[in-house]
Amino acid sequence: KKEDGESTAPTARPKVLRCKCHHHCPEDSVNNICSTDGYCFTMIEEDDSGTPVVTSGCLGLEGSDFQCRDTPIPHQRRSIECCTERNECNKDLHPTLPPLKDRDFVDGPIHHKHHHHHHHHH
């Protein structure tokens, strides 16, 4: 762990980041603002009825690189964008659902292709 005067926090970010949260607010959030040592995110995905749902919030440093990479999930349309450049930066993220292509679902999950838009801001 670092214990010098310049960066005493044993994490990648020297300071906490505040993010807007919606449908994804942890208990320690206040007024729809959460705090994290990792990233802010905004995600769009389809619910069970096929309606697009937008979620936003905080991702902790642990595992957030993987989550922000937006790994395709078979038979699920979703897109996530992450940012760290300023507090509440995820207010300005507007991910869009990847287009539905017929061939995506022809051969089942093994040959599933997933088209997604992903912007990972640092």
Epitope: G5, E6, S7, T8, A9, P10, T11, P14, K15, V16, R18, P26, E27, D28, S29, V30, I33, C34, S35, T36, D37, G38, C58, G60, L61, E62, R86, N87, E88
Partner: antibody
């Protein structure tokens, strides 16, 4: 080394406003939040709020949101706290403090006296 | 708000003794990131507070190893293994998990 320089004392009249300063040195000013904390004689510490100098984003303790306004001047690495409509209840020592995930360095504090 | 309750309010000790200070929070201090943001400070008369322990158990740079922190959730303890004269003053716990951030009322360590 990290230093946060604050004036030693301020004397102001009731009803007036005052702007307290905190000059930071020894680190990159925009890499850390700046917090302000109130301590009345013989009493505990109260968190007033904080500002992120990199984007001027502020968070306030609801108790102080109509009393305190936090600003920064990044060109001089100085944080400011303006206190308005002062009363005797505002007489206290006010500290600025560097914050990442916890406060690691404090200023020496400014003793504010509100008296006619 | 997370209310931080410290005990005892006053702790008379002899030099060389072990001292133990308790800090209890009205709500869990485990942050949604998994970190626990509970910290300890020492304030000597006429001075600003100085950081001793951050995130429950991490000693800040320059802090002697006779200081140690422990605990989890809502219950935390600061221990001083062998009290020295320079350790006298008021000890505060502080949490930065929940906004507004809050402090304990302080424990005064004094000579018996």
């Amino acid at each position: 080394q990290v230093q946060l320089q604050q004036p030693g004392a301020e004397l102001v009249k009731p009803g007036a406003s005052v702007k307290l300063s905190c000059k930071a040195s020894g680190y990159t000013f925009t890499n850390y939040w700046m917090q302000w904390v109130k301590q009345r004689p013989g009493q505990g510490l109260e968190w007033i709020g904080e500002i992120d100098p990199s984007d001027r984003y502020t968070l306030y303790n609801q108790k102080f949101k109509d009393k305190a306004t936090l600003t920064v001047d990044t060109s001089s690495s100085t944080a400011y706290m303006q206190l308005s409509s002062l009363t005797s209840e505002d007489s206290a020592v006010y500290y600025c403090a560097r914050f990442g995930y916890y406060v690691d360095y404090w200023g020496q504090g400014t003793t504010l006296t509100v008296s006619s | 708000d997370a209310v931080m309750t410290q005990s005892p309010l006053s702790l008379p000790v002899s030099l060389g003794d072990q001292a133990s200070i308790s800090c209890r929070s009205s709500q869990s201090l485990v942050h949604s990131t998994g970190n626990t943001y509970l910290h300890w400070y020492l304030q000597k008369p006429g001075q600003s507070p100085k950081l001793l322990i951050y995130k429950v158990s991490n000693r800040f740079s320059g802090v002697p190893d006779r200081f140690s922190g422990s605990g989890s959730g809502t219950d935390f303890t600061l221990k001083i293994s062998r009290v020295e004269a320079e350790d006298l003053g008021v000890y505060f716990c502080s949490q930065t998990t929940h906004v507004p951030f809050t402090f304990g009322s302080g424990t005064k360590l004094e000579i018996k």
